[in-house]
C-alpha cells in the first residue's frame, strides 16, 4: 500500500539527485586540487543530513552547517562575482575569466546549481513527487534555505573589490527581495570589502541609457554607502561584445574601453 505523501506546489527532487551531487563533488575535487582533502561521501552524508527526515517547511541554516563546514573555501580578494537575475552571463564570464568566481564556481554552489531536493518528516525517503514552493508553500524549504546559507557565507568571506552583475532589462535592476538584495548585500563585511562595483547589463542593442542612474541602483548605492563600502557602477552596453573582449582583450575594437560609463 503506497503511504500517504504530502503534496507540495513545487516540482519534486531532481531525478538521480544523490548520484548527481556525488558525481559533481568528485568532478569538482578532481579538477580543483586545492579541494582534494574533501571526502565526497562525507559531503553527501552532510547534505543528506540537512533535509532527510525533516519537515521540509522547517529547515534552518543550522541544518546546513555540517555541510558548510566541509565545503569551506576561500576566494582571493577582488575575485568575487555576485549576480542577480543574470546567472548565465555571469557564468559565461567566469568560464572565460578563470580567476573570478561566482558562488556556483565554488564547491557547494556547483553541487546544487539547478537542482531541487526535499525529504519528508520522519522517513528516510527523498520526495521525488513534489517539494515546497517558496511563494505558495513556505520560504524555509530545503532549497531556499541552502541558497540563503551559502550565499550569506559567500558574501561574508568576500574581500577587496566585490563585483556584481545586474540585469538592466528588468523593471527592478536592483531588487531588495533577490538573494543579492536580501542576503549578500547585508553580509559584505565593511572591514574587508573596500568597494562594490555593479555591472549593469543592457538588453537592447540600441539601448544607450545610463542605467547607473536608475532609482534602484541609487537605492543600492545608498544601502552600500551606509555600510561604509564604496560604490561604483558601470554600464555594459553590449554583453556579447563584453564577453568577446574578455576572451580576446588584444582585439583592436576592445582597446578603446568605451563600452561603459563609470560612476562613483
Amino acid at each position: 500500500v503506497p503511504r500517504w505523501r504530502q503534496q507540495w506546489s513545487g516540482s519534486g527532487t531532481t531525478s538521480r539527485f544523490p548520484e548527481t551531487v556525488l558525481a559533481r563533488c568528485v568532478k569538482y575535487t578532481e579538477v580543483h586540487p586545492e579541494m582534494r582533502h574533501v571526502d565526497c561521501q562525507s559531503v553527501w552524508d552532510a547534505f543528506k543530513g540537512a533535509f532527510i527526515s525533516k519537515y521540509p517547511c522547517n529547515i534552518t541554516e543550522e541544518d546546513y552547517q555540517p555541510l558548510v563546514k566541509l565545503g569551506t573555501q576561500t576566494v582571493p580578494c577582488n575575485k568575487t562575482l555576485l549576480w542577480s537575475r543574470i546567472k548565465d552571463l555571469a557564468h559565461q564570464f567566469t568560464q572565460v575569466q578563470r580567476d573570478m568566481f561566482t558562488l556556483e564556481d565554488m564547491l557547494l554552489g556547483y553541487l546544487a546549481d539547478d537542482l531541487t531536493w526535499c525529504g519528508e518528516f520522519n522517513t528516510f525517503e527523498i520526495n521525488y513527487q513534489s517539494c515546497p514552493d517558496w511563494r505558495k508553500d513556505c520560504s524555509n524549504n530545503p532549497v531556499s534555505v541552502f541558497w540563503k546559507t551559502v550565499s550569506r557565507r559567500f558574501a561574508e568571506t568576500a574581500c577587496g573589490v566585490v563585483h556584481v552583475m545586474l540585469n538592466g532589462s528588468r523593471s527592478k535592476i536592483f531588487d531588495k527581495n533577490s538573494t543579492f538584495g536580501s542576503v549578500e548585500v547585508h553580509n559584505l563585511q565593511p572591514e574587508k570589502v573596500q568597494a562594490l562595483e555593479a555591472w549593469v547589463i543592457h538588453g537592447g542593442r540600441e539601448d544607450s541609457r545610463d542605467l547607473c542612474q536608475d532609482p534602484t541602483i541609487k537605492e543600492l548605492e545608498s544601502i552600500i554607502s551606509k555600510r561604509n563600502i564604496r560604490f561604483f557602477c558601470k554600464n555594459i552596453y553590449r554583453p556579447d561584445k563584453f564577453l568577446q573582449c574578455v576572451k580576446n582583450p588584444e582585439d583592436s575594437s576592445c582597446l578603446s574601453g568605451i563600452h561603459h560609463h563609470h560612476h562613483h
Epitope: 548520484e19 556525488l22 558525481a23 568528485v26 578532481e30 586540487p33 561521501q41
Partner: antibody
Framework: QVQLVQSGAEVKKPGSSVKVSCKAS????????INWVRQAPGQGLEWMGR????????NYAQKFQGRVTITADESTSTAYMELSSLRSEDTAVYYC??????????????WGQGTLVTVSS | EIVMTQSPATLSVSPGERATLSCRAS??????LAWYQQKPGQAPRLLIY???TRATGIPARFSGSGSGTEFTLTISSLQSEDFAVYYC?????????FGQGTKVEIK
C-alpha cells in the same frame, strides 16, 4: 581480492572501431572509478579517461574527446572502452585500472592484464 | 597539460647498489604524484602515491620524496626483481599524465 579481466587481442582496419571490455570481480563494482590507460609498443603510459559506474559519469582526456566512449554495465560489473576512427598510431596495449578508494581515480592499485589492439590495413 | 620528464632514460646499476630516479613536472603538482614499476609483458604496479607513501605490500627499500615540481624515487638496495621500467604519474591536473619512463637495467 580485486581482479580486472580484459577481453582478448583485436586486429582492426584503419577507420573502424574497437570495443574492449574489463570485467571486475572480488569487490563492489559500482562505486569505483574504472580508468583506461594505453601503451603504444615500446612507449610510455597514456591516461585516456575514466568512468564511475554508479554515477554514470565519464571523463576523457582532451586528446581522445569525441573518439573514445567509456561505458559500464553495473549488472555484469563490466566496463567498456570504445575507440573509433582508428589509425595506425592507436596500435597499443589498452589497460583498465582501478583505485583502492571508492569514487576517486587519482592513482591505480589494480590493473587488468591488458588488451593488445593492432590497427593495420 | 602537465608534462612529466623522467631522468635518466636508462640507469645501469649493480644488484645491491642504490638507484635514484628523477621526475620533474612542468608545473607544480603539489604532492599529487605516484610511481609505478612495469616489467616486460606485465601491467604496471603501484609503488608510491602522495609522492612518499608506499602502496600496500611494497618493500621498504622503495622510497619516494619531493613536492612541487621535483620528485625522486629511491631504491636503497637493488634486488634482481627490481630491474624494470619505472614511471611517475601526476594526478594534480586533468588529464593525468605519466613520465616517459626510466629503465633500470643490470650493470
Amino acid at each position: 581480492q580485486v581482479q580486472l579481466v580484459q577481453s582478448g587481442a583485436e586486429v582492426k582496419k584503419p577507420g573502424s572501431s574497437v570495443k574492449v571490455s574489463c570485467k571486475a570481480s572480488g569487490d563492489y563494482f559500482n562505486n569505483y572509478a574504472i580508468n583506461w590507460v594505453r601503451q603504444a609498443p615500446g612507449q610510455g603510459l597514456e591516461w585516456m579517461g575514466r568512468i564511475i559506474p554508479f554515477l554514470d559519469d565519464a571523463n576523457y582526456a582532451q586528446k581522445f574527446q569525441g573518439r573514445v566512449t567509456i561505458t559500464a554495465d553495473e549488472s555484469t560489473s563490466t566496463a567498456y572502452m570504445e575507440l573509433s576512427s582508428l589509425r595506425s598510431e592507436d596500435t597499443a596495449v589498452y589497460y583498465c585500472a582501478r583505485a583502492t578508494s571508492p569514487l576517486y581515480s587519482y592513482y591505480f592499485d589494480y590493473w587488468g592484464q591488458g588488451t593488445l589492439v593492432t590497427v593495420s590495413s | 597539460e602537465i608534462v612529466m620528464t623522467q631522468s635518466p632514460a636508462t640507469l645501469s646499476v649493480s644488484p645491491g647498489e642504490r638507484a635514484t630516479l628523477s621526475c620533474r613536472a612542468s608545473q607544480s603538482v603539489s604532492s599529487n604524484l605516484a610511481w609505478y614499476q612495469q616489467k616486460p609483458g606485465q601491467a604496471p604496479r603501484l609503488l608510491i602515491y602522495g609522492a612518499s607513501t608506499r602502496a600496500t605490500g611494497i618493500p621498504a627499500r622503495f622510497s619516494g620524496s619531493g613536492s612541487g615540481t621535483e620528485f625522486t624515487l629511491t631504491i636503497s638496495s637493488l634486488q634482481s626483481e627490481d630491474f624494470a621500467v619505472y614511471y611517475c604519474q601526476q594526478y594534480n591536473n586533468w588529464p593525468w599524465t605519466f613520465g616517459q619512463g626510466t629503465k633500470v637495467e643490470i650493470k
